[in-house]
């Protein structure tokens, strides 16, 4: 079996953490949010072939259904494993305060 | 903001749960399960549009990011939100066992 | 560690109807390909099929008693239960309940005698 | 109905010796056929799946055989625990329905 984190493809074409820089305006919370201005979003981004990082058994099995059935079913995709926490300064009716987002920047990556 | 759970690309084109049916062999377990012999194999298949079945912040960032950097990075992807265990008799060296799988079939569905 | 246990009333008179309850642990009748299926075995004799559920809720029954049978399950509970209306004599016997994977009766519990008697 | 037929309600051996249980399917039912032990006093206990797999933990001189009607379970090597009633069973269609057993006496 291939190793799960070698990308057949070329290096940095399978699915993988990639950072995006942000302003608060790309985001759409320029009007709930007062800082960070800009944020470095890191998201999973990149391909899924055969054996990479597959996240479970549904994913073996999304991907065998895929090569028989292309047209029905499609590959796994490239989605967050876990999570970082991340704080935002949030307008208030009053001013502000603090809230903590458990579900916000992707930590690492694998496909399901 | 538009019903979570209102498709507006029509009725069934939008993330939810569909269900293929396959045999030992399309899902490449021939060489190790003895049953069951065919499985009704539930998965998450669907466009993830704007505010539809949206899983965290994170795929609302997503979905923003997306409509301003179209070719960097992708639409929310669809995916299982939970699963539902099955039971496998697989084959071992010396006969059968008993085996449940808690990652096998997705129970229900959202974008990330 | 799969156990089951059938519990009944043990002694009951012809024409009533018997109840029996199988409580199960180790496994969930809500995991795909699961079952529990009933079994009685009159003294010294051989094993008969009555019904079985499965975790979708499909029930099947033996075709001879089918009008007599009734199985559900509490899948939160961890619970199946037979009915069996209208008993007779040759309804005594030892009543077992197992645990059901795709047609196999992998577990089963002690069993329960039932006594049927005037 | 299938019928599942077990010819010989006792058999008798020795400790050490071989013995072959059979059971015949009045049709067809592939591969679909399961063993059970139930030692005296006790419940049932799972042996063989599929004809010819022996479920985890059962000693290897216990093997099953047979597809279509004809079904063998041999006990090679018999020991004194295997004093036991013998059943087969087809999950092949609805009733599922078992032999009538054949009972193991040890001399």
């Known amino acids: 079996a291939r190793n799960g984190d070698r990308c057949p493809l070329g290096p940095g074409r399978c699915c993988r953490l990639h950072t995006v820089h942000a302003s608060l305006e790309d985001l759409g919370w320029a009007d709930w949010v007062l800082s960070p201005r800009e944020v470095q979003v890191t998201m999973c981004i990149g391909a899924c072939p055969s054996q990479f990082r597959e996240a479970n058994m549904h994913a073996q099995i999304k991907m065998n259904l895929h090569r028989l059935k292309p047209d029905t079913v499609p590959a796994p995709c490239c989605v967050p494993a876990s999570y970082n926490p991340m704080v935002l300064i949030q307008k208030t009716d009053t001013g502000v305060s603090l809230q903590t987002y458990d579900d916000l920047l992707a930590k690492d990556c694998h496909c399901v | 903001a538009r019903n979570g759970d209102r498709c507006p690309l029509g009725p069934g084109r939008c993330c939810r749960l569909h269900t293929v049916h396959a045999s030992l062999e399309d899902l490449g377990w021939a060489d190790w399960v003895l049953s069951p012999r065919e499985v009704q194999v539930t998965m998450c298949i669907g466009a993830c549009p704007s505010q539809f079945r949206e899983a965290n912040m994170h795929a609302q960032i997503k979905m923003n990011l997306h409509r301003l950097k179209p070719d960097t990075v992708p639409a929310p992807c669809c995916v299982p939100a939970s699963y539902n265990p099955m039971v496998l008799i697989q084959k071992t060296d010396t006969g059968v066992s008993l085996q449940t799988y808690d990652d096998l079939l997705a129970k229900d569905c959202h974008c990330v | 560690q799969v156990t089951l246990k059938e519990s009944g009333p043990g002694i009951l008179q012809p024409s009533q109807t018997l109840s029996l309850t199988c409580s199960f642990s180790g496994f969930s009748l809500s995991t795909y390909g699961m079952g529990v299926g009933w079994i009685r075995q009159p003294s010294g004799k051989g094993l008969e099929w009555l019904a079985n559920i499965w975790w979708n809720d499909d029930k099947y029954y033996n075709s001879a008693l089918k009008s007599r049978l009734t199985i559900s399950k509490d899948t939160s509970n961890n619970q199946v239960f037979l009915k069996i209306s209208s008993v007779d004599t040759a309804d005594t016997a030892t009543y077992y309940c197992?645990?059901?994977?795709?047609?196999?009766?992998?577990?089963w519990g002690q069993g329960t005698l039932v006594t049927v008697s005037s | 109905d299938i019928v599942m037929t077990q010819s010989q309600k006792f058999m008798s051996t020795s400790v050490g010796d071989r013995v072959s249980v059979t059971c015949k399917a009045s049709q067809n039912v592939g591969t679909n056929v399961a063993w059970y032990q139930q030692k005296p006093g006790q419940s049932p206990k799972a042996l063989i799946y599929?004809?010819?797999y022996r479920y985890s933990g059962v000693p290897d001189r216990f093997t099953g055989s047979g597809s279509g009607t004809d079904f063998t379970l041999t006990i090679s090597n018999v020991q004194s625990e295997d004093l036991a009633e013998y059943f087969c069973?087809?999950?092949?269609?609805?009733?599922?329905?078992f032999g009538g057993g054949t009972k193991l006496e040890i001399k």
């Open positions: 069973q087809q999950y092949n269609s609805y009733p599922l329905t």
């Open positions: 197992a645990q059901e994977v795709y047609g196999w009766f992998a577990y």
């Open positions: 599929s004809a010819s």
